[in-house]
């Protein structure tokens, strides 16, 4: 069973001092929501017993294996069902505590009732404050039964449940009609899945005979021991004030376990700690009684004395639960109550015995759960004991269960059962996960779900280049940390696999499935510098750069140009996908903007060092385009252009720029300035005869404006080849008059 205890502090004078603590003795309990152990959960369960809403309860985690619930403001906050959930995977277990109001009309004589399948359960509600109304019994919040208030027997209302079955388990309550539900008596009924002394799927297996009030678990046959007892059969008492499956926990406070209720996994339920009894666990056991709830009687023989925590304390020469066994009878010594081995291992098990006459090697035997008897291979004889060593054949899963060491001499016999847990080494169900990669290293998360048993003691990461036949490299890591694989080759695929191990010999599991992880390209190391830039318009910028000359091939796929607009907090990135490029035209920029510009080389996804930045100011946007541009040939070398001024000008025009290009020509266009902005006409001279030309123009204020429409016109006749166009401008009206 899972080592999980829910403690309720029952000193109820002040609800604000009330607390519930859930303690787990499981390895790695409550560490967090990863594959290595989900957290402990402690909460009030309002599904059956609903209480008025109040301030939220406070949950505090004390280390990894303990969680405490506080913040109860009034007594009604305490009434109801609380649960703690702990353990991982199939071992996830819920422990339940039911709290009754001490001022309720009806109080349970006993809150937890654990019964066997087919038994008759009797729930007894004691009258604390009488009401002359019907008594309503509910099961898990639903109506179950009614008793007339005259049906009380000795001040108690009894609910008899004959032939109970596991589905009958749950929370029962007895309430007077017309009374507050918080005044109910609440009970917890636990019905084991088997008849008395049996366990297993078909209830075919025999329980180990749990001592001291321990309860045999119907699924795994283990004894769930009362608080204060340990061992496979709960045969051993803990020191006063200690609890947990290995007596590893200590009751808080100076008065030990007084005033505490202990709730353990089903089918145990709840009880006071060893040595205490009463509804608030504050009364010490009466003489002759001991154990949880003081339910056990000592009945010590041969001068033994009764200790309320541990039972009979025997004088020398005697042992046994009631000091009924003479020390002449052989006795198994210090046998561990539970042993754990890994599957397919061949462990050695030791069993020591003493007695008079002295046990010899042949008088000690080991019996497996299937009845096979092993004889010891060697024995170590010491003055006070004989230790027999048994070599166990290769373990299989069926070897899990109760083994027995038995000693027989002419003085009598003794046997000790102990639990052997055969654990399956863990095998990863998934491949490790790549977190980050660089050119020479991979950062890997080895945390994966696994089949088999935990806890995980070590994680081995095996890796080698893909399609390689070389030996695997191995790195051993802490289970909870990410792993960095170093000194790898750039741009190389690696096959990576996880191998998990659990404690003990043979705890290494099979390797998990492989995954391919690829290192990044080498980082580009060259730093470019900006050669220059020039503005080609209010929103266009041509940039050029250089790289230092180095021997060998260029490590890079292209360049990244970055323009940072500090005013708007915006970055523009331009990808130049050729590593040979040394110039780029940036378009669609914001006119009148101050940009910070730099360039860097990239390779795969990695960026090299950025060039020193340059600061560029784009001119503001210019005026709208001139309107109604018209071209008219005047001669074999002259064409007159006329236009109208742009509309909605933001300021006075400083000049016009005319673009002249031979139609169908491949050469660059010629730009001609018209420096008298008031004019609306100009004559372009020095053109070639009988040649078709394209014209467009734009105005300039602080920056150049939009281009007008393009017009076409041909020069006249077959004149001489001109030297090239020039212009002469006039007001349009004047030109037309000539």
């Amino acid at each position: 069973a899972v080592d999980l205890t829910l403690l309720a502090n029952l000193r109820l004078t002040d609800p604000q001092r009330f607390f519930l603590t859930c303690v787990s003795g499981e390895a790695g309990a409550g560490r967090g929501s990863d594959a290595w152990g989900p957290p402990l959960l402690l909460e009030k369960d309002d599904r059956i017993v609903r209480t008025p809403p109040g301030p939220p309860l406070r949950l505090a985690r004390n280390g990894s294996h303990q969680v405490t619930l506080r913040g109860f403001s009034k007594p009604s906050d305490l009434v109801g069902v609380f649960s703690c959930v702990g353990g991982a995977g199939a071992r996830r277990t819920r422990v339940i505590y039911v709290h009754n109001s001490p001022g309720a009309h009806l109080l349970p004589d006993k809150v937890t009732h654990t019964v066997n399948k087919g038994d008759t359960a009797v729930l007894s509600a004691r009258v604390h404050k009488e009401k002359q109304t019907d008594v309503i019994w509910k099961s898990n919040g639903s109506y179950f039964y009614t008793l007339d208030w005259h049906e009380a027997q000795d001040g108690r209302f009894l609910l008899q449940l004959p032939n109970v079955q596991p589905p009958s388990s749950g929370i029962y309550s007895a309430t007077y009609l017309e009374a507050s539900p918080l005044g109910s008596a609440f009970f917890r009924l636990i019905v084991r899945g088997c008849g008395a002394g049996r366990w297993g799927p078909g209830c075919t297996k025999e329980c180990p005979g749990c001592l001291h009030g321990g309860v045999c678990h119907d699924h795994d046959g283990e004894c769930v021991c009362p608080p204060g007892f340990t061992g496979t059969r709960c045969e051993q008492a803990c020191r006063e004030g200690r609890f947990g499956q290995s007596c590893q926990e200590q009751c808080p406070g100076i008065s030990g376990c007084r005033g505490l209720t202990f709730c353990l996994p089903d089918p145990y339920g709840c009880s006071c700690g060893s040595g205490w009894r009463g509804s608030q666990c504050q009364e010490a056991c009466a003489p002759g009684h001991f154990g949880a709830d003081c339910r056990l009687q000592c009945q010590c023989q041969n001068g033994g004395t009764c200790d309320r925590f541990s039972g009979c304390v025997c004088p020398s020469g005697w042992h046994g639960v009631h000091c009924e066994k003479s020390d002449r009878i052989p006795q198994i010594l210090n046998m561990a109550s539970e042993l754990e081995f890994n599957l397919e291992t061949m462990p050695r098990i030791n069993c020591a015995a003493a007695g008079n006459p002295f046990p010899v090697r042949g008088s000690i035997e080991l019996r497996k759960p299937d009845g096979t008897v092993l004889l010891s291979t060697k024995a170590i004889v010491e003055p006070e004991k004989t230790t027999a060593e048994f070599e166990v054949p290769r373990l299989v899963l069926a070897d899990s269960g109760f083994w027995e060491c038995r000693v027989s001499t002419s003085g009598g016999q003794d046997s000790r059962r102990f639990k052997v847990n055969v654990k399956v080494p863990p095998v990863p169900l998934a491949a490790p996960r790549l977190l980050t990669k660089q050119s020479r290293q991979l950062v890997v998360s080895p945390l994966v779900s696994f089949s088999g048993d935990g806890p995980i003691s070590t994680v081995r990461l095996h890796y080698r280049p893909q399609d390689s036949t070389m030996d695997w490299s191995t790195i051993v890591v802490d289970p909870s940390e990410n792993v960095t694989l170093m000194n790898l080759r750039p741009k190389t695929g690696y096959s990576v696999r996880v191998q998990l191990s659990r404690p003990g010999e043979g705890g290494e599991g099979a390797w998990g499935p492989p995954t391919l992880m690829t290192t990044d390209c080498p980082e580009p190391l060259l730093q470019p510098w900006l050669e220059g830039w020039h503005v080609e318009g209010t929103d266009r910028l041509r940039v050029s750069w250089s790289l230092p000359l180095v021997p060998g091939p260029l490590v890079g796929d292209g360049f990244l140009l970055r323009l940072w607009d500090g005013t708007r907090g915006q970055e523009r990135r331009e990808n130049v996908s050729s590593p040979q490029a040394r110039t780029a035209l940036l378009t669609g920029l914001t006119p009148g903007t101050h940009y910070q510009l730099d360039v860097q080389l990239y390779h795969c996804t990695l960026l090299g060092p950025a060039s020193p930045p340059a600061h560029v100011l784009l001119p503001p946007s210019g005026p709208p385009a001139p309107r109604h541009l018209h071209a008219q040939a005047l001669s074999d070398s002259e064409i007159q252009l006329t236009w109208k001024h742009p509309e909605a000008l933001p300021g006075p025009i400083s000049k016009y720029v005319v673009e002249v290009q031979v139609a169908g020509g491949a050469g660059d266009p010629l730009w001609i300035d018209v420096d008298r902005p008031e004019e609306t006409s100009t004559i372009i001279r020095g053109l070639n005869a009988s040649t078709r030309y394209l014209f467009r123009m734009r105005a300039s204020i602080q920056g150049l404006g939009d281009w007008s429409n393009t017009v076409e016109e041909s020069t006249l006749g077959n004149g001489l080849q001109a030297e090239g166009p020039v212009q002469e401008s006039r007001a349009a009206e004047e030109g037309l008059d000539q």
Partner: antibody, heavy 121, light 111 residues
Framework: EVQLLESGGGLVQPGGSLRLSCAAS????????MIWVRQAPGKGLEWVSV????????RYADSVKGRFTISRDNSKNTLYLQMNSLRAEDTAVYYC??????????????WGRGTLVTVSS | QSVLTQPASVSGSPGQSITISCTGT??????????VSWYQQHPGKAPKLLIY???NRPSGVSNRFSGSKSGNTASLTISGLQAEDEADYYC??????????FGTGTKVTVL
């Protein structure tokens, strides 16, 4: 279907006896208190008797105490009313009904059709 | 045993609202418990549950029927009176004697 069905009524002479039955179906009969209620011709409803689920506890109206006995057989899902020393004033339609509880409340949610008992010479 | 007193008859026109009262005689019935229920009985038929716990309506019962309680008196109000509401109405209260006390009954007539 959840229902109650009374039977056993009829004509009987004063001082005579009659046994009424009420067969329950469609619900867990054994967990509910069961009640007999009667209604004399042209009169109101009168509570007669209650029997609790165990069958061991019963209550009666003063007008029938000592003459009527309520009982139940949970294995047969049947409620009974044994009526002895009948009087003319016992003439009525006898209904069986169940008492239910919801969030602690008590009321009659299910009624039979009734069976007529006539006491006359 | 306790007695629950109701008016012998109440009448109203269609669409009107009417109220039937139910007054207990002791703290052992209406005044002492919140468990007053109301039943409707048409001639020749078995009673039918209308209201329980003073104010709650079972599913299937029209929301024209509503219940209330003040001190030792419980009330049933029928709003928007309809012809099919013409019937006898009984209140009932839990009593610790184990008895279930019924009211004297009220005949409702729709004019």
């Amino acid at each position: 279907e959840v229902q109650l069905l009374e039977s056993g009524g009829g004509l009987v002479q004063p001082g005579g006896s009659l046994r009424l039955s009420c067969a329950a179906s469609g619900f867990t009969f054994s967990i509910y208190p069961m009640i007999w209620v009667r209604q004399a011709p042209g009169k109101g409803l009168e509570w007669v008797s209650v029997i609790y689920p165990s069958g061991g506890h019963t209550r009666y109206a003063d007008s029938v105490k000592g003459r009527f006995t309520i009982s139940r057989d949970n294995s047969k899902n049947t409620l009974y009313l044994q009526m002895n020393s009948l009087r003319a004033e016992d003439t009525a339609v006898y209904y069986c009904t169940r008492r239910v509880y919801s969030s602690g409340s008590a009321y009659f949610d299910l009624w039979g059709r009734g069976t007529l008992v006539t006491v006359s010479s | 045993q306790s007695v629950l007193t109701q008016p012998a008859s109440v009448s109203g026109s269609p669409g009107q609202s009417i109220t039937i009262s139910c007054t207990g005689t002791s703290s052992d019935d209406v005044g002492g418990y919140n468990y007053v229920s109301w039943y409707q009985q048409h001639p020749g038929k078995a009673p039918k549950l209308l209201i329980y716990d003073v104010i709650n309506r079972p599913s299937g019962v029209s929301n024209r029927f509503s219940g209330s309680k003040s001190g030792n008196t419980a009330s049933l109000t029928i709003s928007g009176l309809q012809a099919e509401d013409e019937a006898d109405y009984y209140c009932s209260s839990y009593a610790s004697s184990g008895a279930r006390v019924f009211g004297t009954g009220t005949k409702v007539t729709v004019l």
